[in-house]
Interface confidence: low
């Protein structure tokens, strides 16, 4: 498709061959808008409308909408993994983001591709924000937004893990790594984790621990494993460099409180 083959690491999906297409059921009769199914799906389905819950594994939001975690969400990527985002008006999100987070000048900006703007796209922000396959969402935790973008190459589909800054410049891992010294160890672990997703057959990071970072890239004091269904993941406390602090853990029954730590 419109994505270029050389950008960043990719998680390859199975090609949409005749066998896959044979499983497709056309969308329901009353569809305001058709979008491709989430993940590596090959079929069409109805887009979600404004205000509907959404996430990485749900149907995609419709044109002009983005899947956005709640602004006060402590772990926005987990919220999106769990389908706890909401389809919100994209322009409203952009205005809010521009108002609250003026983008710092970034070297080597590349203009956003058409595919990145296409309707029905799915971006999943990782510790910071999120909506074929597209636009960045605002979340005040990070100066960069990590998105997992769905693209197409010939007859196969793939997921690209790119960085998108508030100013909507798109950069891949190699260009980002040149500036990694600007970020703390948590940010680098997060990048490594996302990088490893490319080895998965399908993009299904449930169970992959993506660290909870502050805006400078250091570890937030409270870290948690992903939830499994209704079972809450256990949490623990760390210092700003990610070293566990003894005596602060929970197996999910009760919440853990991490007091008087350097990194919030």
């Amino acid at each position: 498709g419109a994505s270029s083959a050389g950008l960043g690491p990719v998680v390859r999906c199975e090609p949409c061959d005749a066998r896959a297409l044979a499983q497709c059921a056309p969308p329901p009769a009353v569809c305001a808008e058709l979008v491709r199914e989430p993940g590596c799906g090959c079929c069409l389905t109805c887009a979600l409308s404004e205000g509907q819950p959404c996430g990485i594994y749900t149907e995609r939001c419709g044109s002009g909408l983005r899947c956005q975690p709640s602004p006060d969400e402590a772990r926005p990527l987990q919220a999106l993994l769990d389908g706890r985002g909401l389809c919100v008006n994209a322009s409203a999100v952009s205005r809010l983001r521009a108002y609250l987070l003026p983008a710092p000048p970034a070297p080597g900006n590349a203009s956003e591709s058409e595919e990145d703007r296409s309707a029905g796209s799915v971006e999943s922000p990782s510790v910071s924000s999120t909506h074929r396959v597209s636009d960045p969402k605002f979340h005040p935790l990070h100066s960069k937004i990590i998105i997992i973008k769905k693209g197409h190459a010939k007859d196969s589909q793939r997921y690209k893990v790119d960085y998108e800054s508030q100013s909507t410049d798109t950069q891949n891992f190699s260009s980002e790594s040149k500036r990694e010294t600007e970020y703390g160890p948590c940010r680098r672990e997060m990048e490594d984790t996302l990088n490893h997703l490319k080895f998965l057959n399908v993009l299904s990071p449930r169970g992959v621990h993506i660290p909870n970072c502050d805006k400078k890239g250091f570890y937030k004091k409270k870290q948690c494993r992903p939830s499994k269904g209704r079972k809450r993941g256990f949490c623990w406390c760390v210092d700003k460099y990610g070293q566990p602090l003894p005596g602060y853990t929970t197996k999910g029954k009760e919440d853990v409180h991490c007091y008087s730590m350097q990194s919030k």
């Epitope: 005749a18 497709c24 059921a25 056309p26 090959c42």
Partner: antibody, heavy 119, light 110 residues
Framework: QMQLVQSGAEVKMPGASVKVSCKAS????????ISWVRQAPGQGLEWMGW????????YYAQKLQGRVTMTADTSTSTAYMDLRSLRSDDTAVYYC????????????WGQGTTVTVSS | QSALTQPPSASGSPGQSVTISCTGT?????????VSWYQQHPGKAPKLMIY???NRPSGVPNRFSGSKSGNTASLTISGLQAEDEADYYC??????????FGGGTKLTVL
Amino acid sequence: QMQLVQSGAEVKMPGASVKVSCKASGYTFTSYGISWVRQAPGQGLEWMGWISAYNGNTYYAQKLQGRVTMTADTSTSTAYMDLRSLRSDDTAVYYCARLSYYNYAMDVWGQGTTVTVSS
Amino acid sequence: QSALTQPPSASGSPGQSVTISCTGTSSDVGGYNHVSWYQQHPGKAPKLMIYEVSNRPSGVPNRFSGSKSGNTASLTISGLQAEDEADYYCSSYTSSNTWVFGGGTKLTVL
């Protein structure tokens, strides 16, 4: 070999109806849609509508709403396009085309059916 | 649904490149990457040449390429050959679950 074979040419009087058939073979009929496209003499392609061969859902071009009906018979893997209240400007070659839900394109075409509306 | 806008004609000599544009709106070309291009020789059915803006079906020469910027899609044919002389139509999926074609461009190989 995937193919769509359409019914033969028709000559109709104004006000009459025409029903064009399109028989699919070489692929799973219900896994794709069928689009209908027409082309008046010396003119460009005009998209008429599409039908889901899986559940019969239809979407028609606004211009033809109320005059066109698309159906699909899964037992024979055949799609039909029925156009009513024919006018002289409906004279055209009518094509059916397989609509792929993967690539949003019409990737296999029938040979065309000439419909002439004349008194 | 208005037809997408294409130039009525285009021409080029063998070996040259020619680009055909297709302009729509944010509800069709600009809103989706579901733009396709079709080639039609006189008296024949159309043939899919490009889908999803820039993908070629198997069997289509790599001389054919597609791109998109904003509300305008483009088909480029490089290394023109005599058999490329035909009518070319763009098509786009629209926000109302329908498709729309361009008016067509007659390509002449000089």
